[in-house]
């Protein structure tokens, strides 16, 4: 297993609709054809997997149908979007990149993007 540098923004504020996007960029030492991207959430010392996708270079990222993540790739950059976020989902979102094929296997883990989420103000009830 060889180490690889992964860069991501330090902090992002999610939109009022609970959507946060950020770029995860990795310094690919070779010509990888198969890449796996995993988003981990660290909160209160607990680390949980948010979503993961494996993709072939030049193709779209495919997350599971029920995933809260979507993404696109361009060269050594992955543009990740996490949706359906609420205030309780505020935390450090860490990008993990694995170059699966061809060998050698490379692993890189970013420092994390702190995502802040604000629950929207409830709309006042209106009578019609």
């Amino acid at each position: 297993c060889k180490a690889m540098h992964v860069a991501q923004p330090a902090v992002v504020l999610a939109s009022s609709r609970g959507i946060a996007s950020f770029v995860c960029e990795y310094a690919s030492p070779g010509k990888a054809t198969e890449v796996r991207v995993t988003v981990l959430r660290q909160a209160d010392s607990q680390v949980t997997e948010v979503c993961a996708a494996t993709y072939m270079m030049g193709n779209e990222l495919t997350f599971l149908d029920d995933s809260i993540c979507t993404g696109t790739s361009s060269g050594n950059q992955v543009n990740l979007t996490i949706q359906g976020l609420r205030a309780m989902d505020t935390g450090l979102y860490i990008c993990k990149v694995e170059l699966m094929y061809p060998p050698p296997y490379y692993l890189g883990i970013g420092n994390g993007t702190q995502i802040y989420v604000i629950d929207p103000e409830p709309c006042p009830d209106s009578d019609f």
């Epitope: 902090v11 992002v12 504020l13 999610a14 939109s15 010392s45 505020t90 450090l92 802040y116």
Partner: antibody, heavy 116, light 108 residues
């Protein structure tokens, strides 16, 4: 090295607006947020809100909602804070401060005096 | 909103003495999101401690932070003349971010 350089002192009349700038250097501006914090004479630190330079999204303290606007110009790595309808109790030193995983670097502060 | 309280409001000590400053949050704060700042008259605040216990770059070892949940402490093991200042704790665990009212450490 990381630096946040703020605009100079301002004297304003009640009801006017003020726009304070904060020019960042020494780091990738869009990877961080900018907080605005003020300090009235002899008082403590009061958080006003912050802007995510990555996407321009903002979050303001309830007290300032509707009266403050925070913006960034990523081409010049500069953040702005505009406060409208100034009152005498808005007299304070206004600080910008960088937010990553925590607030680390601060500007030197801008004194805004509101007086008739 | 998480309300931060600090005690005592003023601490009068002599150089060489140990200073213990307390910060309490109205609800639990993950220690990763608790910072301490020092402010001297006419100057901007300076980051001392982040993540409740990690010293910022260039901060002397006499400054240490501890605590978890709702109770946090800043300790200055042996006060130096340049340490007499106001100290603030701050949380960025939840929006809105909030500061404590400060503890003034002055010369006895």
């Amino acid at each position: 090295q990381v630096q946040l350089v703020q605009s100079g002192a301002e004297v304003k009349k009640p009801g006017a607006s003020v726009k304070v700038s904060c020019k960042a250097s020494g780091y990738t501006f869009t990877n961080y947020g900018i907080n605005w914090v003020r300090q009235a004479p002899g008082q403590g630190l009061e958080w006003m809100g912050w802007i995510s330079a990555y996407n321009g999204n903002t979050n303001y303290a309830q007290k300032f909602q509707g009266r403050v606007t925070m913006t960034t110009d990523t081409s010049t790595s500069t953040a702005y804070m505009e406060l409208r309808n100034l009152r005498s109790d808005d007299t304070a030193v206004y600080y910008c401060a960088r937010l990553g995983h925590y607030i680390d670097y601060w500007g030197q502060g801008t004194l805004v005096t509101v007086s008739s | 909103e998480i309300v931060m309280t600090q005690s005592p409001a003023t601490l009068s000590l002599s150089p060489g003495e140990r200073a213990t400053l307390s910060c309490r949050a109205s609800q639990s704060v993950s220690s990763s999101y608790l910072s301490w700042y020092q402010q001297k008259p006419g100057q901007a605040p300076r980051l001392l401690i982040y993540g409740a216990s990690t010293r910022a770059t260039g901060i002397p070892a006499r400054f240490s932070g501890s605590g978890s949940g709702t109770d946090f402490t800043l300790t200055i093991s042996s006060l130096q003349p340049e340490d007499f200042a106001v100290y603030y704790c701050q949380q960025d665990y939840n929006l809105p971010f909030t500061f404590g009212p400060g503890t003034k450490v002055d010369i006895k």
